[in-house]
């Protein structure tokens, strides 16, 4: 898991991507249920090899998370090819892993 | 405990249109994505297509685009498959379920569609 | 659409006897998923991703296999086994295969 700490490594990363999916966590560390998500997040890193995941701290990365439009946490938001093609709030296990295997 | 219980069983005949209900209990269906699956006697299993009760989103394999139609009401919990120009083919039970990555997934019991004039 | 494609279609086995039968994915598929299911029962989730064991499943069960080639192996046979197994992998089209049932010599 790729820890983004600005909006040019963002888009690096979603350029970097090509083809493959990408799953970005926004969080922050006084987010209680994105705490609970984050060794699940991890561990589905792990899992889907050929996924990439970012994690956006969205008090480290306002602009990044500004411009995406987070309105609460945590929020996944799923690129390909540098467009979004899915979005969720909750740490929602079930559903994050039905949507990436949905889409990678 | 987390409970998916269906409708009872149709008998409905050649052309018309049916409705199959999927209440669930122990959980909220706005949490994951609900599935039907089809089964013909003595047959093996079909995924016919899931929704997103959340926003309503649904996909469904190309095989029953057309002849299958999955809702979702929120407020009571429950998933429906609405079944289409009915003919022998539709006889069947279809499922409907929970299918999680998980050590545990779940299903209903079962509701059995038999089309005859 | 990714087939799955079981392998055999039907077997016999004897209590005591060892177990195989595999499923064949048209192409690559990251984790395998299988369920058993009895006459006029609902499927059970059985072995998911891959190998590991849903609960209340015997320890006699196991799952293997990787890419487009996979297997469910059953050390020593039961007579509660008897039952018929669809494989099922759930990508962005999830499908299952037509099934191997399993009865008792």
């Known amino acids: 898991v790729k820890q983004i700490e600005s909006k040019t490594a963002f888009q690096e990363a979603l350029d970097a991507a090509g083809d493959k999916l990408v799953v970005v966590d926004f969080s922050a560390t006084w987010c209680g249920p994105c705490k609970m998500i984050k060794p699940f997040f991890h561990s589905l890193s792990e899992k889907y090899s050929n996924v990439i995941f970012l994690e956006v701290d969205v008090d480290d990365c306002q602009d990044v998370a500004s411009e995406c439009e987070v309105k609460c946490m945590p929020t996944f938001q799923f690129f390909k090819k540098g467009q979004k093609v899915g979005e969720f709030s909750g740490a929602n296990k079930e559903k994050l892993e039905a949507i990436i295997n949905e889409l990678c | 405990e987390v409970q998916l219980q269906q409708s009872g069983a149709e008998l409905v005949k050649p052309g018309a249109s049916v409705k199959l209900s999927c209440t669930a209990s122990?959980?909220?269906?706005?949490?994951?994505?609900m599935h039907w699956v089809k089964q013909r006697p003595e047959q093996g299993l079909e995924w016919i297509g899931r929704i997103d009760p959340a926003n309503g989103n649904t996909k469904y394999d190309p095989k029953f685009q057309g002849k299958a139609t999955i809702t979702a009401d929120t407020s009571s919990n429950t998933a429906y498959l609405q079944l289409s120009s009915l003919t022998s083919e539709d006889t069947a039970v279809y499922y409907c379920?929970?299918?999680?990555?998980?050590?545990?997934?779940?299903w209903g019991q079962g509701t059995s569609v038999t089309v005859s004039s | 659409q990714i087939v799955l494609t079981q392998s055999p279609a039907i077997m016999s086995a004897s209590p005591g006897e060892k177990v195989t039968m595999t499923c064949s994915a048209s192409?690559?598929?990251?984790?395998m998923y299988w369920y058993q299911q009895k006459p006029g029962t609902s499927p059970k989730r059985w072995i998911y991703d891959t190998s590991k064991l849903a609960s209340g499943v015997p320890a006699r069960f196991s799952g293997s296999g990787s890419g487009t080639s996979y297997s469910l192996t059953i050390s020593t046979m039961e007579a509660e086994d008897a039952a018929t197994y669809y494989c099922h992998q759930r990508s962005s089209y999830p499908t299952f295969g037509a099934g191997t049932k399993l009865e008792l010599k």
């Open positions: 379920a929970l299918l999680q990555y998980s050590a545990m997934d779940y």
């Open positions: 192409s690559r598929i990251s984790y």
């Open positions: 122990g959980f909220n269906i706005k949490d994951t994505f």
